[in-house]
């Protein structure tokens, strides 16, 4: 058995078959071009599609691998926490928010009640909080990553909030609304200081922040555009205007990646010019959300990253570089502005 000698030269798994020796990798690893060495890929795409959450490496040619999750019915929004290698997703049929490790283990529902259509969701990787937008309840809520200490942040004058993006280092959250007057809004991450950034827009989706260049990106389902603006909603630029049906969107390094429902594809292009287009994966129906899993998408620092800001429950970032302690529903903040009291 050739595998008996130095594991056949394989870094991880050595498989001996009649056809000969073959190296393989545990879930979460990928075989590089030497066909012997397994690595944790530095960057990969995650996407949700019906009952599947799948990954595509951006660095090796091992494409479109399902993350082995059980019980998913209709995955919608996706995000991740790079520090513990976990993914988070909403399921609009189960009406839950769940999480699991990238290898599919330790799957658990973190929010199981009071959800209707949780179409938007984002991880605050500094404060270790989970934010979500529900188009059914017309609320934006927050909890700890495990679902504890849940609090409603925005509920007044919300009309079908959809895509949600966080900038925890700056203390802002951004979301789109799909109601009678679609728009893109911003607020501090405690729900205060709300303002409309982009009033004249169609149903914007896939809201994504380029943290390095300080730009917002989104798809517009009514105009079929991919657009960009600065963080104030100004200096708008059309990145692509000839797409049949762009839907999900993410950004990584010099590229934007998007899903197109009509072309049944995941594609990428230069994030400023929209040029150098490539189909990453074709023949995919109704990809709901897409993101790039990479540590560079979750960098920065704020006060909540250090000992939860010494808050007893929620530490919520606010501009500029500040924070407030938040309390779960029915709890009240004590005079020390740090601890919460039960009702």
């Amino acid at each position: 058995n050739p595998c008996a000698e130095e594991n056949g030269g394989c870094s991880h798994l050595c498989l001996y078959r009649p056809q000969g020796l073959r190296c393989a990798c545990p879930i979460g690893f990928e075989l590089i071009s030497d066909m012997k060495t397994c690595i944790v890929p530095e960057a990969f795409l995650l996407f949700s599609r019906r009952a599947d959450i799948r990954r595509i490496s951006l660095e090796t040619n091992n494409n479109n691998v399902a993350i082995p999750l059980t019980g998913v019915k209709e995955a919608s929004a996706l995000d991740f926490d790079v520090t513990d290698n976990r993914i988070y997703w909403t399921d609009i049929s189960l009406k839950t928010i769940s999480r699991a490790f990238m290898n599919g283990s330790a799957l658990e529902h973190v929010v199981e009640f009071g959800l209707d259509y949780p179409e938007g969701m984002a991880v605050d990787w500094l404060g270790k909080n989970l934010y979500w937008a529900d188009t059914g309840t017309n609320r934006i809520e927050v909890s700890k990553l495990d679902g504890q200490h849940r609090q409603v942040l925005v509920w007044k004058d919300l009309d079908s909030p959809r895509a949600l993006a966080l900038d925890p280092a700056e203390g802002f959250m951004y979301w789109t609304e799909w109601g009678g007057k679609p728009k893109i809004d911003r607020a501090a991450m405690d729900g205060s200081e709300r303002t409309t950034l982009v009033p004249n827009v169609g149903r914007a989706n896939g809201l994504t922040i380029d943290y390095a260049k300080r730009r917002l990106y989104w798809t517009d389902l009514d105009t079929n555009l991919i657009e960009s603006s600065n963080m104030l909603g100004l200096n708008r630029e059309v990145i692509a205007d000839d797409l049949p049906h762009p839907f999900g969107l993410t950004q990584y390094q010099d590229y934007i990646y998007w899903t197109d429902w009509s072309r049944r594809s995941i594609e990428r292009a230069n994030k400023t010019s929209g040029q150098n287009r490539t189909i990453i994966q074709g023949h995919l129906d109704y990809v709901m959300d897409i993101l790039v899993f990479h540590s560079s998408r979750q960098s920065g620092w704020n006060e909540c990253a250090s000992s939860n800001g010494h808050c007893s429950h929620l530490c919520l970032a606010v501009p500029v570089g500040g924070f407030v302690c938040g309390c779960p529903a029915h709890y009240s903040l004590n005079a020390d502005n740090r601890t919460c009291s039960a009702p």
Epitope: K73, S93, W261, R264, H283
Partner: antibody, heavy 119, light 108 residues
Framework: QVQLKESGPALVKPTQTLTLTCTFS??????????VGWFRQPPGKALEWLAW???????SYSTSLKTRLTISKDTSKNQVVLTMTNMDPVDTATYYC???????????WGQGTLVTVSS | DIVLTQSPATLSLSPGERATLSCRAS???????LAWYQQKPGQAPRLLIY???NRATGVPARFSGSGSGTDFTLTISSLEPEDFATYYC?????????FGQGTKVEIK
């Protein structure tokens, strides 16, 4: 505006092969996404999906008829062709082609062509 | 294959009345993978609703779709004379896509 029209023989003998052509205008199957699907409807009965082809030449066929069906496209002519082998009287139906704008959602239909299978 | 069962087979109503058509799937088909088509005698089908609740271009607001999982509904809030036709539901959650057997809405 989007228009589709089916053409082919009105009468086919049992065991023969049926060839239907869908000629369309108002959209393209080049790189703008979408596709074209074929359906049929026996007299007085429900719709049945047969096959579709998309802009990227991906094809899908009805499970029960897949061994008898072939779908192809000619992008330059704005045409999609469906062939169905070994025709039988139970295949008598009105055959429709339709534009697939989003996956498996057909937003524009041809008028249909009645195909009778009889000796 | 997923089987779609439409009920009732025939619905007899008068103009101005509300029509409620049901479509039940034999297994789970999600919340947005159902379409409704209208077909009049001698004509091709016409897309009314896709994604369970989105009206197709040019479809009047009196048509609305709802439901998720296995149970879906097409509602016509106030029947107009041109609405008397046969309505088909179609699922596209799983391959192959399938149609219901149709509900005929006729004048009472």
């Amino acid at each position: 505006q989007v228009q589709l029209k089916e053409s082919g023989p009105a009468l086919v003998k049992p065991t023969q092969t049926l060839t239907l052509t869908c000629t369309f205008s108002g959209f393209s199957l080049s790189n703008r996404g979408g596709g074209v699907g074929w359906f049929r409807q026996p007299p007085g009965k429900a719709l049945e999906w047969l096959a579709w082809i998309d802009w990227d030449d991906d094809k899908s066929y009805s499970t029960s008829l897949k061994t008898r069906l072939t779908i192809s496209k000619d992008t330059s002519k704005n045409q999609v062709v469906l062939t169905m082998t070994n025709m039988d009287p139970v295949d008598t139906a009105t055959y429709y082609c339709a534009r697939m704008h989003l996956p498996l959602v057909f937003d524009s239909w041809g008028q249909g062509t009645l195909v009778t299978v009889s000796s | 294959d997923i089987v779609l069962t439409q009920s009732p087979a025939t619905l007899s109503l008068s103009p101005g009345e509300r029509a409620t058509l049901s479509c039940r799937a034999s297994q789970f088909i999600g919340s947005r993978y159902l379409a409704w088509y209208q077909q009049k005698p001698g004509q091709a089908p016409r897309l009314l609703i896709y994604g369970a609740s989105n009206r197709a271009t040019g479809v009047p607001a009196r048509f609305s779709g709802s439901g998720s999982g296995t149970d879906f509904t097409l509602t016509i809030s106030s029947l107009e004379p041109e609405d008397f036709a046969t309505y088909y539901c179609q699922q596209y959650y799983d391959y192959p896509q399938t149609f219901g057997q149709g509900t005929k809405v006729e004048i009472k």
